[in-house]
């Protein structure tokens, strides 16, 4: 069933007790919003607002530049993801809203949140991808000079959307409308019923290829980076070190909270107190993570940008030189200002 | 005590409506849900529908849309379901029944049953 | 449709007799507040249902200690530790999470 013929229902939540008392009213109302779903909605609001007017302006900047240099590409890709994440934010938004209320059916249902979640895998892994880059350029400077092309950073780029999708199909699967009875609600999520194990593999392999994985590339990255800058004596490898802490950090504190949720709800039985907590931090979880749609952005422009007042530029050519600078090796762009000086160096060295 | 008391049996035609009445008392009449569930000839129960007393909102399972309408006369605590359409398979015996709740009033539960009324569908 | 099965469809039993009849719902019944609206009824022929156990394990006031119902998620069981002579009769399970509420299609209690 796609729609339902819903009518806004006489209740709102209720808390639900164990007793029997048959001579109270039906009709004890408490429309209040818990903490952690208005704290959700301000999140969601914000990242929204910051994160559809950031990443449109990447896009708008980069796609012109895609074509001839692989730093737009991989920005392109990235901004596109969180771009395309911040629009689904409405619905989420009015469902929370709406005490968790799915209006929309069932085959949005299917496709929105597992649209979404295809989104946020897809930024996850094209910055693991970036961060590669980022070692090749320093570390692989002749194999750059050969092979490093455009044409490589777009299949590099499938390849991640690829996987993403792969790691959302599951959620796609298993997702379906579920009608309460009361309070009359129309509820949208997975459902996997009799098999605790499919769910468990599926919470493991989102937690593995989702979040430690492109972690662990990340930290193996950047740290051989961070060590090459400091062997070489680098003059702004304090720069580097601020970027790399700014993208590793924020990859963790936003992502850490959704991943550990996930995968200590699909251990914990759905009756649990520890399971219903977690289910009401649930919306604030997803939240958390999304700012990373908008984040992202923000990160680049401040690291990029150098504190060397460019900001008095317009907007649009700030993002211009940050994410389209040449760098030594060939065509290929520098990730950061800060990064571009120092591979310069580590380039002419090596 | 409370006590739900249904209307006599029907025989119907195919294609022919029936009107089911339901009386309540022994409780305040507007404070629980009123449901409908029909039992074929040595058939298990299947839930039709709600009717919320109190707003007049109204419930019907998927399968009787269009079909059944529940409705609901406050003054004298009755509660009437109609079927439209009816067909051979709609012979059945219909009853009404009092969702209960617990202590937040909630309507979880069917604790109380009417008698049940016969309806045949013959031609 | 939450489809609710009922095994077995038909048992035969003496007095005295532990009696377990399950029922397995087609996906999981948890409600989005924790609680599992999982219910039994007993019906004896010609007479309407009568309330036994709401949500799982709770019985409803009256009804004897001697009836007990368990189980979470999917799969639940109602126990009946020593039959007596007026628990033959028929056995449904209910749940009423989901919208449409669906019942099973019953087991007939027999005397052996």
């Known amino acids: 069933m796609d729609s339902f013929n819903y009518t806004t229902p006489d209740y709102g939540h209720y808390d639900d007790k164990d007793t029997l008392d048959l001579n109270t009213p039906v009709d004890k109302t408490s429309n209040t919003l818990r903490v952690p779903d208005i704290l959700a909605l301000v999140i969601f609001a914000v990242v929204f607002l910051v994160g559809v007017l950031g990443n449109a302006l990447v896009v708008w900047v980069t796609a012109f530049e895609a074509k001839r240099t692989i730093n737009a590409i991989w920005f392109l890709n990235l901004a596109v993801a969180d771009f395309l994440s911040c629009l689904a934010l409405p619905i989420l938004f009015t469902s929370i809203v709406q005490h968790h209320h799915w209006p929309f059916g069932g085959a949005a249902c299917s496709i929105l949140p597992s649209l979404i979640l295809l989104n946020m895998y897809a930024s996850i892994l094209l910055l693991a991808t970036i961060s590669a880059d980022r070692f090749l350029l320093v570390f692989k400077p002749i194999w750059c000079q050969n092979f490093r092309g455009a044409g490589l950073a777009w299949i590099a780029c499938a390849v991640a959307w690829g996987l993403a999708l792969l790691l959302t199909i599951p959620s796609f699967l298993y997702r379906v409308v579920r009608e309460e009875y009361f309070p009359p609600k129309v509820l949208c999520g997975v459902d996997y019923s009799h098999d605790k194990r499919r769910e468990r593999a599926v919470a493991i392999v989102r937690l593995v290829l989702g979040f430690l994985w492109p972690l662990l590339t990340l930290t193996i990255c950047y740290t051989f980076i961070l060590l090459r800058t400091w062997s070489r004596r680098a003059t702004r490898s304090t720069k580097t070190l601020k970027v790399v802490v700014a993208v590793v950090a924020s990859f963790f504190i936003f992502w850490l909270p959704y991943q550990v949720t996930g995968i200590m709800m699909s251990f914990l039985e759905p009756s649990s107190p520890t399971f219903l907590l977690l289910k009401k931090l649930d919306s604030l979880c997803v939240s958390f993570a999304y700012i990373n749609c908008c984040i992202n952005p923000i990160i680049y422009v401040v690291a990029g940008q150098g504190f060397q007042g460019r900001l008095r530029k317009s907007l649009p050519s700030l993002l211009r030189n940050v994410l389209t600078e040449e760098s030594v090796v060939r065509e290929s762009k520098s990730f950061t200002r800060s990064t571009v000086d120092t591979m310069a160096q580590k380039t002419q060295a090596v | 005590q409370v006590q739900l008391v249904q209307s006599g049996a029907e025989v119907k035609k195919p294609g022919a409506s029936v009107k089911v009445s339901c009386k309540a008392s022994?409780?305040?009449?507007?404070?629980?849900?009123m449901h409908w569930v029909r039992q074929a000839p040595g058939q298990g129960l299947e839930w039709m529908g709600y009717l919320n007393p109190s707003s007049g909102y109204t419930k019907y399972a998927q399968k009787f849309q269009g079909r059944v309408t529940m409705t609901r006369d406050t003054s004298t605590s009755t509660v009437y379901m109609e079927l439209s359409s009816l067909r051979s398979e709609d012979t059945a015996v219909y009853y009404c029944t009092r969702s209960g709740g617990d202590n937040y009033g909630n309507p979880y539960y069917f604790d109380r049953w009417g008698q049940g009324t016969t309806v045949t569908v013959s031609s | 449709d939450v489809q609710m099965t009922q095994s077995p469809s038909s048992l035969s039993a003496s007095v005295g007799d532990r009696v377990t009849i399950t029922c397995r719902a087609s996906q999981s019944i948890v409600h989005s507040n924790g609680n599992t609206y999982l219910h039994w009824y007993q019906q004896k022929p010609g007479k309407a249902p009568k309330f036994l156990i709401y949500k799982v394990s709770n019985r409803f006031s009256g009804v004897p200690s001697r009836f007990s119902g368990s189980g979470s998620g999917t799969d639940f069981t109602l126990t009946i530790s020593s039959l007596q002579p007026e628990d033959f009769a028929t056995y449904y399970c209910?749940?009423?999470?989901?919208?449409?509420?669906?019942f099973g299609q019953g087991t007939k209690l027999e005397i052996k």
């Open positions: 022994g409780y305040t009449f507007t404070n629980y849900w």
């Open positions: 209910a749940q009423y999470t989901l919208v449409p509420l669906t």
